[in-house]
Interface confidence: low
């Protein structure tokens, strides 16, 4: 239904707190360099304006679109050109081009310092003084670093943060209460960020159809008792919600997400038997809970899939009559039978099926041609299963840090032209898959591993797109989203790469490394490892292990020495010489 004033409608639907939070996220995601205070001022102005429209929908400007209202606010910021350069050119455009322009200027890797958590005492003081401002800072800092973060989900994480602080700031030992809990929220939020970025990439690069296919597969796995019409309805609604969030329409996105949660809870009988616990929760927790609800029990009486999709003599007729519906049904039927497959794998299988029908339905004897299609799926299924087994075995043998190093060597060999910081970030993220997925039950490993790896590789592609340096990476990133992970896995040593010359300063360390937190120490060592591989791309695992063990021993010795500086300056050159010899 059309509303006289869109802004009044959204303010009424969302309520002041969520309205303000979402406007703050929107501004922070568009203008990533502005301070919290600058954005907070804009948010207050927009909120005050929304209230005047709630009081009188016919008041001046209340009939304007949200893009127009928000865009005008952003474009009125002083010194926009000095701070944002060419982004200021967006303000010369009219809607909807202006919003598209803002979206194109979102930076996936802004030049901002890492978000450092203050110490417990200071955090609790500022939280107690002004909880609203404290949470505003959290929303601002996360949103500007993650310009595609799923906005309603970010409100959920802010709520989690709030609850943790409320609880822990009342304890005697605030630090030991806060640290593990906030670390847990941070880890979940980072995973949520890369997953959502993948969804927006899917939408941006391949359109709504691609995202809807993803949604059909995912929802069919989770709700195998829902019929195809129900799954299609949910997938259509979910596609709309994600399209809005990816497009910067955060108020509409959050409002529609709340509507979808409401619909699901009102229709549990036709969707899933597992929703009640989620539906008993308040809004943000309810929507979050529904998004990761456990799979419903698969119906016991599902017939073999071949009957409808291989053995039926009408396959080509059914396909020709409504291609998308027929393929959607195939994806639904396959996915509801395989909660143990990754969505990426299911989409590859559907793509294979589509290609087979396109080819076979044009031939003289189609059934003979498409009759073997299920056997052709086997290698497609075996490949990721083998990947999971090999990598989880390696993770169990090496632990997370060692596993990250193995991946770092592998990926540096595949794409040595990529910058070392990018390779280290990617390998550390890819390596976390072990901790995240390899401890899960067997049937959950494959979906966990492959869909997580796909999301991380999507980030690699986004970063590489801005600075294309490796033909290997360009090749894998240019294809469809679901083929990326197999493409990266299949890459071997880049034979075209000319090894980097050995520079002693790259491997020269100082005593300041001793006082770094463990994570930073690991990054320093992993940076050195990547540089070693760039120097000797064909070094054996044994050679690299020898050098890294020597390096670890050197750090351990010098960091324990009475005169650290002298130890580093005398032992350092010896280490460099030994490294060169070991790799010669």
């Amino acid at each position: 239904e059309a509303h006289k004033s869109e802004i009044a409608h959204r303010y009424n639907d969302l309520g002041e707190q969520h309205f303000k939070g979402l406007v703050l996220i929107a501004f922070s995601q568009y203008l990533q360099k502005c301070s919290y205070d600058e954005h907070a001022k804009l948010v207050q102005e927009v909120t005050d304006f929304a209230k005047t429209c709630v009081a009188d929908e016919s008041a001046a400007n209340c009939d304007k679109s949200l893009h127009t209202l928000f865009g005008d606010k952003l474009c009125a910021i002083p010194n926009l050109r000095e701070n944002y350069g060419e982004l200021a050119d967006c303000c010369t455009k009219q809607e909807p081009e202006r919003n598209e322009c803002f979206l194109q200027h979102k930076d996936d890797n802004p030049s901002l310092p890492p978000f450092e958590r203050p110490e417990a005492e200071a955090m609790c003081t500022s939280f107690k003084e002004n909880p609203t401002t404290f949470m505003g800072h959290y929303l601002h800092e996360v949103a500007r670093r993650h310009p595609y973060f799923y906005a309603p989900e970010l409100l959920y994480y802010a709520e989690q943060y709030n609850e943790i602080l409320t609880q822990c700031c009342a304890e005697a030992d605030k630090e030991s209460c806060l640290t593990p809990k906030l670390d847990g929220v941070k880890e979940k939020a980072l995973v949520s960020s890369v997953r959502q970025r993948m969804k927006c990439s899917s939408m941006q690069k391949f359109g709504e159809r691609a995202f809807k296919a993803w949604a059909v597969a995912r929802l069919s796995q989770t709700f195998p008792n829902a019929d195809f019409a129900e799954i299609t309805k949910l997938a259509t609604d979910l596609t709309k919600v994600n399209k809005e969030c990816c497009h910067g329409d955060l108020l509409e996105c959050a409002d529609d997400r709340a509507e979808l949660a409401k619909y699901m809870c009102e229709n549990q009988a036709t969707i899933s038997s597992k929703l009640q616990t989620c539906c008993d929760k308040p809004l943000l927790k309810k929507a979050h809970c529904l998004s990761e609800v456990e799979h419903d029990t698969m119906p016991a009486d599902l017939p073999a899939i071949a009957a409808d999709f291989v053995e039926d003599q009408e396959v080509c007729k059914n396909y020709a009559e409504a291609k998308d519906v027929f393929l959607g049904t195939f994806l639904y039927e396959y996915s509801r039978r395989h909660p143990d497959y990754s969505v990426s794998l299911l989409l590859r299988l559907a793509k294979k099926y589509e290609a087979t029908l396109e080819k076979c339905c044009a031939e003289a004897n189609p059934p003979a041609c498409y009759g073997t299609v299920l056997a052709e799926f086997q290698p497609l299924v075996e490949e990721p299963k083998n990947l999971v087994k090999t990598n989880c075995d390696l993770y169990e043998k090496l632990g997370e840090y060692g596993f990250q190093n193995a991946i770092l060597v592998r990926y540096t060999q595949k794409a040595p032209q990529v910058s070392t910081p990018t390779l280290v970030e990617a390998a550390r993220n890819l390596g976390r898959v072990g901790t995240k997925c390899c401890t899960l039950p067997e049937d959950q490993r494959l979906p966990c591993v492959e869909d997580y790896l796909s999301a991380i590789l999507n980030r690699v592609c986004l970063l590489h797109e801005k600075t294309p340096v490796s033909e290997h990476v360009t090749k894998c990133c240019s294809g469809s989203l679901v083929e990326r992970r197999p493409c990266f896995s299949a890459l071997t040593v880049d034979e075209t790469y000319v090894p980097k010359e050995f520079k002693a300063e790259t491997f020269t360390f100082h005593s300041d490394i001793c006082t770094l937190p463990e994570k930073e120490k690991q990054i320093k060592k992993q940076t050195a490892l990547a540089e070693l591989v760039k120097h000797k791309p064909k070094a054996t695992a044994e050679q690299l292990k020898t050098v890294m063990d020597d390096f670890a021993q050197f750090l351990d010795t010098c960091c324990k020495a009475a005169d650290k500086d002298t130890c580093f300056s005398t032992e350092g050159p010896n280490l460099v010489t030994r490294c060169k010899d070991a790799l010669a």
Epitope: G85, S111, V418, S419, P421, T422, E465, K466
Partner: nanobody, 116 residues
Framework: EVQLVESGGGLVQEGGSLRLACAAS????????LGWYRQGPGNERELVAT???????SYADSVKGRFTISRDYDKNTLYLQMNSLRPEDTGLYYC??????????WGQGTQVTVSS
């Protein structure tokens, strides 16, 4: 610390040409956008032209058809070819490199003066 050094500025007659160059002191792998900016006497710094790593270019309306931005990947250098220069093109020209992993880099600037 990587430095950007502009060169090629100078005094030129109206209608003349200049080619500005901006060289980085070392290879920068994490570039995502390169640009030329200028600051005329008593004016704010303004965007002249940008080029992405995929070589798509964008120009200010006032220089379209007269200026061409380009880059030499191997030499790590950004160029601005300026033809049909006008007095209003006078100013200090800066190059900027927007990076993916580090903060953006600005050059010190090179002076361009167009006499009528």
């Amino acid at each position: 610390e990587v430095q950007l050094v502009e060169s090629g500025g100078g005094l030129v007659q109206e209608g003349g040409s200049l080619r500005l160059a901006c060289a980085a002191s070392e290879r920068i792998w994490d570039i995502n956008l390169l640009g030329w900016y200028r600051q005329g006497p008593g004016n704010e710094r303004e965007l002249v032209a940008t080029i992405t790593v995929g070589d798509s270019t964008s120009y200010a309306d006032s220089v379209k058809g007269r200026f061409t931005i380009s880059r030499d990947y191997d030499k790590n250098t950004l160029y601005l070819q300026m033809n049909s220069l006008r007095p209003e093109d006078t100013g200090l020209y800066y190059c900027k490199i927007r990076r993916t992993w580090h903060s953006e880099l600005w050059g010190q600037g090179t002076q361009v003066t167009v006499s009528s």
